[in-house]
């Protein structure tokens, strides 16, 4: 008996030929030997299957001899065998239809569990093996699960059904959504406009939720909620913003706000949190502003940075052109009685500059002048 | 070569039957169908009924259903097909088309029926 | 039951003139569907058969193509003989329902 694999809601086509190579009469019939379709000469008869409205054939194939019964919107219980009657002979066909689900939904945040749930005939005994859009495989029986989902897990997934040394290959589409960094800092120098920008790492046709920004300066005690806001279907609307800082959002994704000015009292790390709706949990985004500013306040030439730095970083003091006069691991460094000329303090890591803010120092006789 | 050779003209009483035949040559008359059209004066085709000569098996369109019966002689190769409760409306050519391999690829000639008091 | 809709339903052109009739089933029919020529006081004529198949002794220049729920019939170059109504059915579900027909005539 011939063993054909079918999926949920596809098409198959089982194929019957006769010998002679004309249009002859013939017909299917499933295992209960209730009539399928047949032909009347030229013309397609059906029986009074449940399958009437979903059973076809092919009438241009039938002068070859070739009497293919097409099952459309496969379901489960469609898995039977199948007799196909033509010239005094039988041919039997066993179809097998199989179906692979995610739970729930292919859109998850980041972070939780998919699970694939494979549906199977009676009496089947199927092994399934999924492929991730990075390349990990898991196996497994009547349902797959993955934990902890990543970004990289976005994408199609391939799974493939075995069952009687035959296969039938599923993909589904798993969107993960997240932003498209963990993490982000930004380093701006004392006074700067600083913009913060919190892309999506998916696209959907309509998105719609709530979000908002935390943040806690390294000055203060605890945190502050810095601005609430509403997102429909792509348009963003602020809910409540403080008056201090007093930031400003775009209308439209990506999210994107903008604070005024980079001040010392402002710098530490923000937590952007985005609640999807029909979501139960939440999208995160870390966000850190570092802000430097250069000051001299009579003979001492300072450099400070605030807000959260690593401490492999180095702050620098230099005059243009020369060799750094000061260098250090650390969040503030000075120089007493600076020569006159352009100053530079210098956040670097690894040799890459990361933040820049000049100083002009003029001779002892005059003020110094801040470019 | 085949043929297919219908009976003549016929008037007819509102109420009444007519019975049409159909006389097949040149062909196994039981290893086809037979199938049946008429077509009303200016119209177009309309479907009816098919017959299987061999299993005496048929198939009418719903319309129909209750007042055509088709039946066949295969002592004379002859396929009849029978409406009655007659009404104006019914005043059409009537066909009988064999089911060839490909399709009803051979007619009669038909035969107009007239309903008229 | 299936409804057949022809387009147009009259039609003029002239001799060497392309042609083309549709047909549209109101349900996927697949390609159980023929189209027949009639001509005046004669019965009607099998010109294609399973949608595309051509049925012998039917010149070349017509030709069928559709499949699902549109359908159509070309006539690549006009004779004169070829002004007639033209006539698609179903072939896929009882009753075997016709098009309401489409006439060809000279321009």
């Known amino acids: 008996k011939k063993v054909v694999l079918g999926k949920k809601g596809d098409t198959v086509e089982l194929t019957c030929t006769a010998s002679q190579k004309k249009s002859i009469q013939f017909h299917w019939k499933n295992s209960n030997q209730i009539k399928i379709l047949g032909n009347q000469g030229s013309f397609l008869t059906k029986g009074p299957s449940k399958l009437n409205d979903r059973a076809d054939s092919r009438r241009s194939l039938w002068d070859q001899g070739n009497f293919p019964l097409i099952i459309k919107n496969l379901k489960i219980e469609d898995s039977d065998t199948y007799i196909c009657e033509v010239e005094d002979q039988k041919e039997e066909v066993q179809l097998l239809v199989f179906g692979l689900t995610a739970n729930s939904d292919t859109h998850l945040l980041q972070g939780q569990s998919l699970t694939l749930t494979l549906e199977s005939p009676p009496g089947s005994s199927p092994s399934v093996q999924c492929r991730s859009p990075r390349g990990k495989n898991i196996q497994g029986g009547k349902t797959l699960s993955v934990s902890q989902l990543e970004l990289q897990d976005s994408g199609t997934w391939t799974c493939t059904v075995l069952q009687n040394q035959k296969k039938v290959e599923f993909k589904i589409d798993i969107v993960v959504l997240a932003f498209q960094k963990a993490s982000s800092i930004v380093y701006k120098k004392e006074g700067e406009q600083v913009e913060f920008s919190f892309p999506l790492a998916f696209t959907v046709e309509k998105l719609t939720g709530s979000g908002e920004l935390w943040w806690q300066a390294e000055r203060a005690s605890s945190s502050k909620s810095w601005i609430t806001f509403d997102l429909k279907n792509k348009e963003v609307s602020v809910k409540r913003v403080t008056q201090d800082p007093k930031l400003q959002m775009g209308k439209k994704l990506p999210l994107h706000l903008t604070l005024p000015q980079a001040l010392p009292q402002y710098a530490g790390s923000g937590n952007l949190t985005l609640a999807l709706e029909a979501k139960t949990g939440k999208l995160h985004q870390e966000v850190n502003l570092v802000v430097m500013r250069a000051t001299q306040l009579q003979k001492n030439l300072t450099c400070e940075v605030w807000g959260p730095t690593s401490p492999k970083l180095m702050l620098s003091l230099k005059l243009e052109n020369k060799e750094a006069k000061v260098s250090k691991r650390e969040k503030a460094v000075w120089v007493l009685n600076p020569e006159a000329g352009m100053w530079q303090c210098l956040l670097s890591d690894s040799g890459q500059v990361l933040l820049e803010s000049n100083i002009k120092v003029l001779p002892t006789w005059s003020t110094p002048v801040q470019p | 070569q085949v043929q297919l050779v219908q009976s003549g003209a016929e008037v007819k009483k509102p109420g009444s039957s007519v019975k049409v035949s159909c006389k097949a040559s040149?062909?196994?008359?039981?290893?086809?169908?037979m199938h049946w059209v008429r077509q009303a004066p200016g119209q177009g085709l309309e479907w009816m009924g098919w017959m299987n000569p061999n299993s005496g098996n048929t198939g009418y369109a719903q319309k129909f259903q209750g007042r055509v019966t088709i039946t066949a002689d295969e002592s004379t190769s002859t396929a009849y097909m029978e409406l009655s409760s007659l009404r104006s409306e019914d005043t059409a050519v009537y066909y009988c088309?064999?089911?060839?391999?490909?399709?009803?690829?051979?007619w009669g000639q038909g035969t107009l029926v007239t309903v008229s008091s | 039951d299936i409804q057949m809709t022809q387009s147009p339903s009259s039609l003029s052109a002239s001799v060497g003139d392309r042609v083309t009739i549709t047909c549209r089933a109101s349900?996927?029919?697949?390609?159980?569907l023929a189209w027949y020529q009639q001509k005046p006081g004669k019965a009607p004529k099998l010109l294609i058969y399973?949608?595309?198949s051509l049925q012998s002794g039917v010149p070349s220049r017509f030709s069928g193509s559709g499949s699902g729920t549109d359908f159509t019939l070309t006539i690549s170059s006009l004779q004169p003989e070829d002004f007639a109504t033209y006539y698609c059915q179903q072939s896929y579900s009882a009753p075997y329902t016709f098009g309401q027909g489409t006439k060809l005539e000279i321009k």
């Open positions: 040149g062909y196994t008359f039981t290893g086809y169908y």
């Open positions: 088309a064999r089911d060839g391999v490909t399709g009803t690829d051979y």
């Open positions: 349900q996927d029919i697949n390609d159980f």
């Open positions: 399973a949608a595309s």
